[in-house]
């Protein structure tokens, strides 16, 4: 660093003598008290041929000095008066001091009634004085002088002294504020120091600290620091900041020149919007929480959120950080589509690229459907099952079950149902069943009921009497039976066109019909099977019913 | 009467080095100290740097960072300033002054004009 | 570093006017500010040293007053010999001395 400047002192302590008086100077260094090896004098700017740390001056003008421990001292304005009266002032004086002012007539002993005056206004209560004290004085330019009466014979002759400036000293240094930065990035911390200096030749007074952004105190008020901490400057923050220092008695008080501090709004850039789940597949039902986020920015930033086709935005946030979160909670099918999100902390916001909310939807229950050329299927239709979920996201694949074992399977890639073709046969009754499944978890239909009907065969009529000829007074029993055919199966039976009667069967074996013979009984016998898809005839049997002995009976 | 002459206007090329002198005359040369001050074209003035013809003590401006080198010879109450490393930046006139804390006597100037 | 701000950077007078030229440094500098001038084509000449003493063989009509960051060198009637450039140096922390940007006096 610097080294300190070298102090120049007056014995004795007055800056103005008279013609033909000797005035000491000592040059001090703060690190000594007195200074160590070779000492530099200068007078008027010109080097003396003396090393001493003390001399002895008879000539007026600017005296300096400079130590080996020191750089040059502030210069020092001797005086030395060919005048009758001088006003003397003590040197050093400081801004805050109580200085003595002394009256000196070149013959004091016949200098009397001494009245002494500060900018030619006498002060109050310095008549006849030797010396008087002014208080706290300042470094302004005030003038003082003094009057006396000089003895001359039996003559008092008024004089005047000539007027004397005080060399007041800065007892510290007008205060510069220095801040950290001057344009500081918002958020960012930022130190403010309040910059002096005291006098080294009065290091036992203390100061205190007070530092302002335009007429607010900031932080405590007066401390004894000159530092100021500032954890996070905000754009509000910006304006006129100032410090003052003062003696902590009050005595001196000095303003630092204001600095204008802005504080700096870094704008927001490379805004983005992150989806999670990660990548934007969703399950209706789940939460989703839209991320948005700047790389930078500073300040204040206002997030909002937006989806295509969508007028109004999802929402806004406005808060100090780089990262804001919005939570749409259980997300539903209308939710798919495409989101942005914008920041804003200048005046335009900055908006993400677009991204792709997908929403999958679980399948609902489905419903097996059967579609068929007729109310009741009958052997040989063809059967189509239909399955279909109302909800669910393709592709969705449906599987087919008969008496729970799987017919098939087959797929929707784009929605709606499926179908499942079947060409029935008999053993095709039973229950059917179906299951959605497009991987978010399988559905399962409820059973549904499937009877095949079977057309009756041609039904076989067959007589059956008690020998081989049939005669009056046997009891002949007509069967007639159709070996294919769904129950209940309806058989009629018929002697030549007329109406014998009709059994229902609804198992099988057949139906029987019995008669007790008569001769009339002989004839063309038929019988006729239907269970509703269509009768079937059998074949004409011809009965011969002899009314004489039976071994003469027979059928044909 | 104080007097400081300084020698004559120099051109040189970029890159190359100059040395200039002040003599002095009219007082006792080693009782003060001799400063070196720079004008630019138009400009304020830069203070170079301060020499103690006494004992040879340079200062130098901080900022400068090693452009200049000053020398003295009491012998002839001459005091050299050299600058090295020449570009056109250092074209201006070059002012040597006595005094301590103030400029009190200056001498005419030395114009430098660097070329390319 | 000590800043020496001088204003205004040109004044336009009259012969005859009285002016105050303002020179301004960054930190308190005490009274170690010195004012001179300079004609075109000549070198600068000391006019004022420590802020307020004058200097033997400059006209009564230059004048300085000021002391810690503020300073004026004033002129008492203004003659045609005094327009050129007014620059104001600090001395305060030894030996870096800075020079203010400089005030032009010219001819309204």
């Known amino acids: 660093g610097v080294a300190p400047k070298a102090v120049l002192l007056l014995n004795p302590p007055w800056s103005t003598a008279f013609k033909g008086e000797k005035v000491a100077l000592i040059c001090s260094s703060i690190s000594h008290s007195l200074a160590q090896g070779d000492t530099y004098w200068y007078h008027d700017e010109k080097l003396l041929k003396i090393k001493h740390d003390k001399i002895q001056i008879t000539e007026p003008g600017n005296y300096q000095c400079k130590t080996r421990g020191s750089s040059l001292s502030d210069a020092v304005h001797v005086e030395f008066s060919p005048d009758w009266l001088i006003l003397q002032a003590l040197h050093p004086v400081f801004e805050g001091d109580n200085v003595i002012l002394r009256c000196q007539g070149k013959d004091n002993k016949n200098t009397h009634q001494k009245v002494y005056y500060k900018d030619g206004k006498q002060l109050p209560n310095s008549y006849n004085l030797e010396k008087i004290t002014v208080n706290s004085v300042s470094r302004d330019n005030s003038k003082y002088h003094c009057t006396a009466y000089r003895k001359f014979y039996i003559l008092d002759i008024e004089v005047t002294s000539k007027p004397l400036n005080i060399q007041v000293q800065e007892l510290f240094l007008h205060p510069v504020l220095r801040a950290s930065s001057s344009t500081p990035i918002e958020g960012s911390p930022m130190t403010l120091t309040c910059e002096t200096q005291l006098s080294p030749q009065r290091p036992d007074v203390q100061l205190q600290f007070s530092l302002f952004r335009d007429s607010q105190t900031l932080g405590l008020g007066w401390s004894r620091s000159p530092r100021l901490q500032i954890p996070a400057m905000w754009t509000e923050d910006s304006g006129s900041y100032w410090c003052e220092v003062e003696t902590v008695t009050h005595s001196i008080k000095k303003r630092s020149l204001r600095s204008q501090i802005r504080v700096q709004r870094v704008p927001v850039s490379n805004v983005n919007l992150e989806i999670r789940p990660t990548g934007g597949q969703l399950i209706e039902g789940e939460n989703m929480v839209l991320i948005c986020s700047v790389a930078q920015g500073s300040g204040t930033v206002t997030f909002s959120w937006h989806k295509e086709g969508r007028v109004r935005s999802l929402g806004r946030k406005t808060q100090r950080s780089l990262l804001a979160e919005l939570h749409v909670l259980t997300v539903k099918e209308s939710d798919a589509g495409r989101y942005y999100c914008a920041a804003d902390n200048v005046h335009s916001p900055i908006l993400s690229t677009w991204i792709r909310v997908t929403v999958r939807i679980p399948v609902s229950h489905p419903v097996l459907t059967f579609r068929a050329p007729r109310a009741h299927t009958v052997v040989g239709d063809l059967l189509e099952l239909h399955c279909e979920s109302l909800r669910g996201s393709p592709p969705i694949l449906y599987r087919f079950y008969h008496e729970d074992v799987t017919l098939g399977n087959s797929s929707a890639p784009s929605g709606g149902g499926a179908s499942f073709n079947l060409s029935l046969t008999a053993e095709h009754s039973g229950n059917y069943s179906c299951d959605a499944d497009n991987g978010l978890g399988a559905q399962h239909s409820h059973g549904v009921s499937l009877r095949v009907t079977v057309p009756v065969s041609r039904p076989v009529l067959t007589l059956r009497a008690p020998g081989a000829q049939a005669v009056v007074g046997d009891l002949l029993e007509l069967h007639c039976e159709s070996l294919r055919g769904s129950f209940p199966i309806l058989y009629w039976f018929y002697h030549e066109d007329d109406t014998l009667g009709n059994i229902s069967a609804h198992s099988g074996g057949g139906a029987s019909f019995n008669l007790s013979l008569t001769t009339e009984h002989s004839g063309n016998y038929s019988c006729e099977a239907d269970n509703g898809l269509g009768a079937q005839h059998s074949k004409v049997v011809t009965l011969n019913v002899t009314g004489t002995s039976r071994n003469r009976t027979g059928l044909t | 009467e104080v007097q400081l002459q300084q020698s004559g206007p120099e051109l040189v090329k970029s890159g190359a080095s100059v040395k200039m002198s002040c003599k002095a005359s009219g007082y006792t040369f080693t009782d003060y100290y001799m400063k070196w001050v720079k004008q630019s074209h138009g400009k304020s003035l830069e203070w170079i740097g301060d020499i103690n013809p006494y004992n040879g003590e340079t200062f130098y401006n901080q900022k400068l960072k090693g452009k200049a080198t000053l020398t003295v010879d009491k012998s002839s109450n001459t005091v050299f300033m050299q600058l090295n490393s020449l570009t056109s930046e250092d074209s201006a006139v070059y002012y040597c002054?006595?005094?301590?804390?103030?400029?009190?006597?200056w001498g005419q100037g030395t114009t430098l004009t660097v070329s390319s | 570093d000590i800043q020496m701000t001088q204003s205004p950077a040109t004044l336009s007078v009259t012969p005859g006017d009285s002016v105050s030229l303002s020179c301004r440094a960054s930190q308190s500098i005490s009274n170690n500010l010195h004012w001179y001038q300079q004609k075109s084509h000549e070198s600068p000449r000391l006019l004022i040293k420590?802020?307020?003493q004058s200097i033997s063989g400059i006209p009564s009509r230059f004048s300085g007053s000021g002391s810690g960051t503020d300073f004026t060198l004033s002129i008492n009637s203004v003659e045609t010999e005094d327009f050129g450039m007014y620059f104001c140096q600090q001395s305060n922390n030894w030996p870096q001395y800075t020079f203010g940007g400089g005030t032009k006096l010219e001819l309204k």
């Open positions: 420590f802020a307020s």
């Open positions: 002054a006595r005094g301590l804390y103030f400029f009190a006597y």
